[in-house]
Amino acid sequence: NFMYSKTVKRLSKLREYQQYHPSLTCVMEGKDIEDWSCCPTPWTSFQSSCYFISTGMQSWTKSQKNCSVMGADLVVINTREEQDFIIQNLKRNSSYFLGLSDPGGRRHWQWVDQTPYNENVTFWHSGEPNNLDERCAIINFRSSEEWGWNDIHCHVPQKSICKMKKIYI
């Protein structure tokens, strides 16, 4: 019957994700019992995405690799609301890699998922970015300006934030 085949589909989808994420936390989307959205446990969710704060200190390249192994990317921040959600889970005395880099040192910033870089939706600290040698972006806290972005050397180990699309089952 219909409910049985839906359950089978769900189970096979869950098996797909099990290699990365042994446990998912799912919530019912809206009123329809058939639509569930899930994030890996203990990732947090906001709108249509899941977020994970990685506290291991790694270079930007290794951080991105670490996210991709989990089926995610370093975080791409698209709105002020999204950044406001993310910072609730960050520590003020730490810095976290974003999925934003300037690979050629030409001030041509680009997001890991090819989202177009829009100067009008950026949250750089004042006077940042400011160095051709600093090709990767972090988010950190400055007492004068609260949370914002800064450019730093990509090889200097930092914590990081991973982001993935919610899993719909």
């Epitope: 040192g105 006077g127 160095n131 051709l132 040698d133």
Partner: antibody, heavy 118, light 107 residues
Framework: QVQLQQSGAEVVKPGASVKISCKGS????????MHWVRQAPGQGLEWIGV????????NYNQKFKGKVTMTVDKSSSTAYMELSRLTSDDTAVYYC???????????WGQGTLVTVSS | DIQMTQTTSSLSASLGDRVTISCRAS??????LNWYQQKPDGTVKLLIY???RLHSGVPSRFSGSGSGTDYSLTISNLDQEDIATYFC?????????FGGGTKLEIK
């Protein structure tokens, strides 16, 4: 203290090439890109380009593409700039300068005079 | 490319004078404006970066100001050792470009 020591003056014939060097000391060489700037006799300063001492990639001023090649030897903390197919217009003092925060060249070498003459 | 213009190519002043050198960019450079001093022997030193920040070791008689396209360097109490040519440079956009220079002489 930060020092950039450039190689000595060169006199070269038209059509030839010349390679000038810039040795950095007093800081971590690979943390700072190296810029090259030229000054023709009685003229102002002109930015030639910049090379990353960490990655080894370069950004050139379009005007100098094909004329200039920048390289780096990390083991000796030295940046090089080779000028090819020299003409009298290339007679100038060439400076290396360290990259700094706020898109600036914070320390400069003493300059290398290249004279192109037959 | 962004054009940088220093309208005054040479300037004569007396010791102790307050001297201002100006620089104009062909478009907004977001305060990424730096000032360099070139001594007669060819030595080049950074004085001011990001419009108004004093580089380490530079005497406090040097100051910078400006925004958008118009910037200036001020030497508040002219000293004999300030005899030099002063260049502005924009770092907002590659290729970086310099003004033509202002040569400062003593009256």
């Amino acid at each position: 203290q930060v020092q950039l020591q450039q190689s000595g003056a060169e006199v070269v014939k038209p059509g030839a090439s010349v390679k000038i060097s810039c040795k950095g000391s007093g800081y971590t060489f690979t943390d700072y890109s190296m810029h090259w700037v030229r000054q023709a006799p009685g003229q102002g300063l002109e930015w030639i380009g910049v090379i990353s001492t960490y990655y080894g990639d370069s950004n050139y001023n379009q005007k100098f593409k094909g004329k200039v090649t920048m390289t780096v030897d990390k083991s000796s903390s030295t940046a090089y700039m080779e000028l090819s197919r020299l003409t009298s217009d290339d007679t100038a003092v060439y400076y290396c300068a360290r990259n700094g925060n706020f898109y600036v060249m914070d320390y400069w070498g003493q300059g290398t005079l290249v004279t192109v003459s037959s | 490319d962004i054009q940088m213009t220093q309208t005054t190519s040479s300037l004569s002043a007396s010791l102790g004078d307050r001297v201002t050198i100006s620089c104009r960019a062909s478009q907004d450079i977001s305060n990424y404006l730096n000032w360099y001093q070139q001594k007669p022997d060819g030595t080049v030193k950074l004085l001011i970066y990001y419009t108004s920040r004093l580089h380490s070791g530079v005497p406090s008689r040097f100051s910078g100001s400006g925004s958008g396209t118009d910037y200036s360097l001020t030497i508040s109490n002219l000293d004999q050792e300030d005899i030099a040519t002063y260049f502005c440079q924009q770092g907002n956009t590659l290729p970086w470009t310099f003004g033509g220079g202002t040569k400062l002489e003593i009256k």
